[in-house]
């Protein structure tokens, strides 16, 4: 079952999923200057059965250099001060994550997508949290959020996190810190 | 709560055009496109477009090119459609949509008599 | 354009029986496709999505099934509250089309 809304946004946060549920979708957005081609998906989805998952659809892009006749455009939106959620990544995945069943990994880039990649959850997804570059990680307790069901509506889990304004950044659970990777992301990750 | 408010019922005169809105709450207003649906008695459920708030990037419906117009102000998480030269073929209910169709709001009826 | 036929534009079932609404498409849309259930004076309400994912809070008789272009949206164990209008949606190519809608009257 589909989660009503979207993680809880924690301020100079930003989350991931090491694995998606099934069930999952994957809106096909394209960077700035190009469109989803006319006959494309919506969105992907994790589609399978417990042994294994994959995938469905493929997102494609095209160029909107006839926008003004067409006006098919799927853009990058224009301001994105503080990525809020799950950012484009290439396809770096522990080893044993497609042993998880149920879950899909972290879908690989298609050609033109934006920067920025839009998840639909569902019931039961857990997504990490850690602190933009920059930032050091205060925490309370857990730094994730779940979707969980409650008398028939969903609700997302409160990380215990807070990030501070020190240099120091944050990883996701098992990670090692980062050297000089990009926005202090992670080269390789471990399963949840 | 994720929710979309749309505008009051509009009584309008054949020939004008009109403005309605659908105002956003409980989500990321820029991360997600919202339709535009158009339901008529006896004619079902028509797909008039959408907008990205984002960019104010737009897809139309064929039959609705220079009928439909669609615009977004991100300060107030509210989008827009306007209908021009209005016709009793206009008179229906129009639904905005966000979140790949899973949330609607609760239409905004449209009646055009002289 | 897609077109999406529901062949039944009424249905007449009794509750606690199970009725299957159908919808064809006049092309391949994957399993592009979702079903709306809207009642007298109100906004469509989202049931499937991918075909046959429910969302939230949509109680587990109903079902959706079908890729390609022949869909299924199935109510086992109908009850009362189920008198409504479901519509199923392609999304698979611009225009996004809808069905004509299958009126379901209960006995």
């Known amino acids: 079952e589909l989660c009503d809304d979207d993680p809880p946004e924690i301020p100079h946060a930003t989350f991931k999923a090491m694995a998606y549920k099934e069930g999952t979708m994957l809106n096909c957005e394209c960077k700035r200057g190009f469109r989803r081609i006319k006959s494309g998906s919506l969105y992907m989805l994790c589609t399978g059965n417990s042994s294994h998952s994959s995938w469905d659809n493929q997102c494609q892009c095209t160029s909107s250099a006839t926008r003004n006749t067409t006006k098919q455009v799927t853009p990058q939106p224009e301001e994105q001060k503080e990525r809020k959620t799950t950012e484009m990544q290439s396809p770096m995945q522990p080893v044993d994550q497609a042993s998880l069943p149920g879950h899909c990994r972290e879908p690989p880039p298609w050609e033109n997508e934006a920067t920025e990649r839009i998840y639909h959850f569902v019931v039961g997804q857990m997504v990490y949290y850690q602190c933009v570059q920059g930032y050091r990680a205060l925490h309370r307790g857990p730094a994730e959020s779940v979707c969980k069901m409650t008398h028939g509506k969903t609700r997302w889990t409160q990380p215990q996190l807070i990030c501070t304004g020190e240099m120091e950044t944050s990883q996701f659970p098992g990670e090692e810190k980062p050297q000089a990777s990009p926005e202090g992301r992670p080269e390789s990750e471990t399963s949840c | 709560q994720i929710q979309l408010q749309q505008s009051g019922a509009e009584l309008v005169r054949p020939g004008t055009s009109v403005k309605m809105s659908c105002k956003a709450a409980?989500?990321?207003?820029?991360?997600?496109?919202i339709g535009w649906v158009k339901q008529r008695p006896g004619h079902g459920l028509e797909w008039i477009g959408d907008i990205h708030p984002g960019g104010s990037y737009t897809n139309y419906n064929e039959n609705f090119k220079g009928k439909a117009t669609f615009t977004a102000d991100t300060s107030s998480s509210t989008t827009y459609m306007q209908l021009s030269s209005l016709t009793s073929e206009d008179s229906a209910i129009y639904f905005c949509t966000s979140r790949n169709f899973a949330k609607w709001g609760q239409g905004t009826p449209v009646t055009v008599s002289s | 354009d897609i077109v999406l036929t529901q062949s039944q534009k009424f249905m007449s079932t009794s509750v606690g029986d199970r009725v299957s609404v159908t919808c064809k498409a006049s092309?391949?849309?994957?399993?592009?496709v979702a079903w709306y259930q809207q009642k007298p004076g109100q906004s469509p309400k989202a049931l499937i999505y991918?075909?046959?994912y429910r969302y939230s809070g949509v109680p587990d008789r109903f079902t959706g099934s079908g890729s390609g272009t022949d869909f299924t949206l199935t109510i086992s164990n109908v009850q009362s509250e189920d008198l409504a209008e479901y519509f199923c949606?392609?999304?698979?190519?611009?225009?996004?089309?809808f069905g004509g809608g299958t009126k379901l009257e209960i006995k």
């Open positions: 092309q391949n849309v994957g399993t592009n």
């Open positions: 949606q392609q999304y698979n190519s611009y225009p996004y089309t």
């Open positions: 409980g989500y990321t207003f820029t991360n997600y496109w």
């Open positions: 991918s075909a046959s």
